[in-house]
């Protein structure tokens, strides 16, 4: 295309531009430290700062930490991106009762429909299970095993859930978590794409490089980069993604280059005190007892309310192991088990007393 030759020469004569043969046009050369937002930037506004991994560029052009979703009850919904925080949501089996910026501050277990009730609407990350009276024709053997779950003790749950007493009430802490979850996270994160860098179990082979093209020194094509576990906030600053390392938190969305990690309460818990992109305090979620029914919620993030089932309805199940399945956990976790493989060395909060469990592993007394 001979007609492109003069244009290319013009580019060469202009130090602020370069010629892109792929698109056969003159492109604006982003200043050092900024990266192009498109293949061939045309103007300075087509260039952006880049933060380090786990930080995002906020509205004020500052790199700000993405929230973390490392609490056991949170999972990552959307990753930390260059211009937005990671977003967390309650992990499967839980719903958010108290929202937080980019996360959930309070997750509770989905209610289990009691005897005589069946699931009308299954629980989601935002809404609790909605129960309704079982149809008269439903056999006592239960229409679904899901409707037979009862607390193993058969006791009526507390109207108000009790706090889980985490080691710290802050939503941005970094305690060690149980090894099982860490191992699962580590396994899942080793395959994460470069634009959603891992924050836990990362093999540390990728220091959080730009998800766009690599940038040779002096090329001017560097996008603003953040370190691992930082994201580029709206202000263009690298900001620390929140951590979800508390035992009662799970990661809802990972730390991405432009958004914080978000955390949510782990299954079986609900957020009592919200925090930005996380939850400051998780409490156990109450389970519907026999002879109660979950009242449908107008608000997506309210606690479950209970009322007596309509007259004439009979419990379909007995709260026994034969007919019902006990929930995995109906009580708050009172200690944090430190797994020896959670990190290269064991980071133990200086405020928490340490004891040794029967397995010989240190246990953080969160009480």
């Amino acid at each position: 295309f001979p007609q492109d030759r003069p244009f290319e020469d013009t580019c060469h004569g202009n130090p602020s531009h370069y010629y892109d043969k792929a698109v056969r046009r003159c492109c604006y050369r982003c200043p050092m430290g900024l990266f192009p937002t498109q293949q061939c930037p045309q103007r300075p506004t087509d260039c952006r700062k880049q933060c380090e991994p786990d930080y995002y560029l906020d509205e004020a052009d500052r790199c700000t930490a993405c929230v973390t979703c490392s609490r056991d009850d949170l999972v990552e919904k959307t990753p930390c991106a260059w211009n937005s925080s990671r977003v967390c949501e309650c992990r499967p089996g839980m719903f958010c009762s108290t929202s937080a910026v980019n996360s959930c501050a309070r997750c509770f277990f989905h209610s289990v429909c009691p005897a005589g009730m069946i699931v009308k609407f299954p629980g989601t990350a935002q809404k609790n299970t909605v129960c309704e009276p079982a149809s008269p024709g439903v056999s006592p053997a239960c229409a679904s095993p899901e409707n037979c779950k009862e607390p193993s003790s058969g006791t009526i749950p507390q109207a108000k859930p009790t706090p889980v007493s985490p080691a710290t009430s802050s939503a941005s802490t970094m305690p060690v978590r149980g090894g099982t979850r860490l191992a699962q996270e580590a396994a899942s994160k080793l395959t994460r794409a470069p634009d959603s860098p891992s924050s836990v179990g990362r093999p540390s082979s990728d220091p959080g490089l730009s998800p766009t093209q690599p940038c040779p020194e002096g090329s001017g094509d560097c996008r603003k980069q953040c370190e691992p576990d930082y994201y580029l906030d709206e202000a263009g600053r690298c900001t620390a993604c929140v951590s979800c390392s508390r035992d009662d938190l799970v990661e809802k969305t990972p730390c991405a280059w432009n958004s914080s990690r978000t955390c949510e309460c782990r299954p079986g818990m609900i957020c009592a005190t919200s925090a930005t992109n996380s939850c400051a305090r998780c409490v156990p979620y109450p389970i519907c007892a026999a002879e109660t029914v979950t009242k449908p919620q107008d608000m997506a993030e309210k606690d479950t309310t209970f009322e007596a089932p309509p007259l004439g309805t009979q419990p379909d199940c007995n709260p026994t192991p034969e007919n019902g399945e006990a929930p995995a956990s109906t009580s708050p976790t009172q200690s944090l088990l430190v797994d020896s493989q959670a990190s290269k060395t064991l980071p133990i909060p200086t405020s928490a007393p340490v004891a040794l469990s029967s397995t010989g592993k240190p246990v953080l007394d969160a009480g």
Partner: antibody, heavy 123, light 107 residues
């Protein structure tokens, strides 16, 4: 073990430039960013900027923008910090530092530091 | 930029004393704060990260607490080797910033 070894002291005149080196060993150089922090005599610490040795990309504190250039040579596992248009207030100990490989997250607090390079700017 | 104000700037104490240093951030930094100890002519050494987690090998007399904007470094029983300068650092938002330092001197 991780080591960061910096170049020796420098005496410079105002308006001149200085280039301080930081040789890394004990880990894969391209895996971690290298940060530079300075400390004027009797004062606190001030973050200058960092480089990603893998990509060559760097980021600087606005206070130094235009005067500082941080580079890295992968072949020698060495990072460099060059500060130009020196003034007397640039007299300080300059440190290179690396974040920890510790805990579950990779936040930028520094577990490894070079021994420091004293840069004196005086006419 | 986030400012970190450390207090006191100077502190005279005796061996065995309980010492508390505070660090106040100009805006919320979560728990993204580290504490360093620095002795004359030496590079800083990290003591605490994530506001309350002791770094490997740091004696348990050092503890950290706080979140949001107010942070504290406590030395439960001052030892002769603890006479040094202490700095806080926020790593929540870039640019990374440090406190002005607290010099702990022998009374």
């Amino acid at each position: 073990q991780v080591q960061l070894v910096q170049s020796g002291s420098e005496l410079k005149k105002p308006g001149a430039s200085v280039k301080v080196s930081c040789k890394a060993s004990g880990y894969t150089f391209t895996t971690y960013t290298i940060h530079w922090v300075r400390q004027p005599p009797g004062k606190g610490l001030e973050w200058i900027g960092y480089i990603n040795p893998s990509s060559g990309c760097s980021d600087y504190n606005q206070n130094f923008q235009g005067r500082v250039t941080i580079t890295a040579d992968k072949s020698t596992s060495t990072a460099y910090m060059e500060l130009s248009s020196l003034r007397s207030e640039d007299t300080a100990v300059y440190y290179c530092a690396r974040r920890a490989d510790y805990g579950n997250y990779e936040y930028t607090w520094f577990a490894y530091w070079g021994q420091g390079t004293t840069v004196t700017v005086s006419s | 930029d986030i400012q970190l104000t450390q207090s006191p700037s100077f502190l005279s104490a005796s061996v065995g004393d309980r010492v508390t240093v505070t660090c106040k951030a100009s805006q919320n930094v979560g728990t993204n704060v580290a504490w360093f100890q620095q002795k004359p002519g030496k590079a800083p050494k990290v003591l605490i990260y994530s506001a309350s987690y002791r770094y490997s090998g740091v004696p348990d007399r050092f503890s950290g607490s706080g979140s949001g904007t107010d942070f504290t470094l406590t030395i439960s029983s001052l030892q002769p080797e603890d006479f040094a300068e202490y700095f806080c650092q926020q790593y929540h938002t870039y640019p990374l910033t440090f406190g002005g330092g607290t010099k702990v001197e022998i009374k």
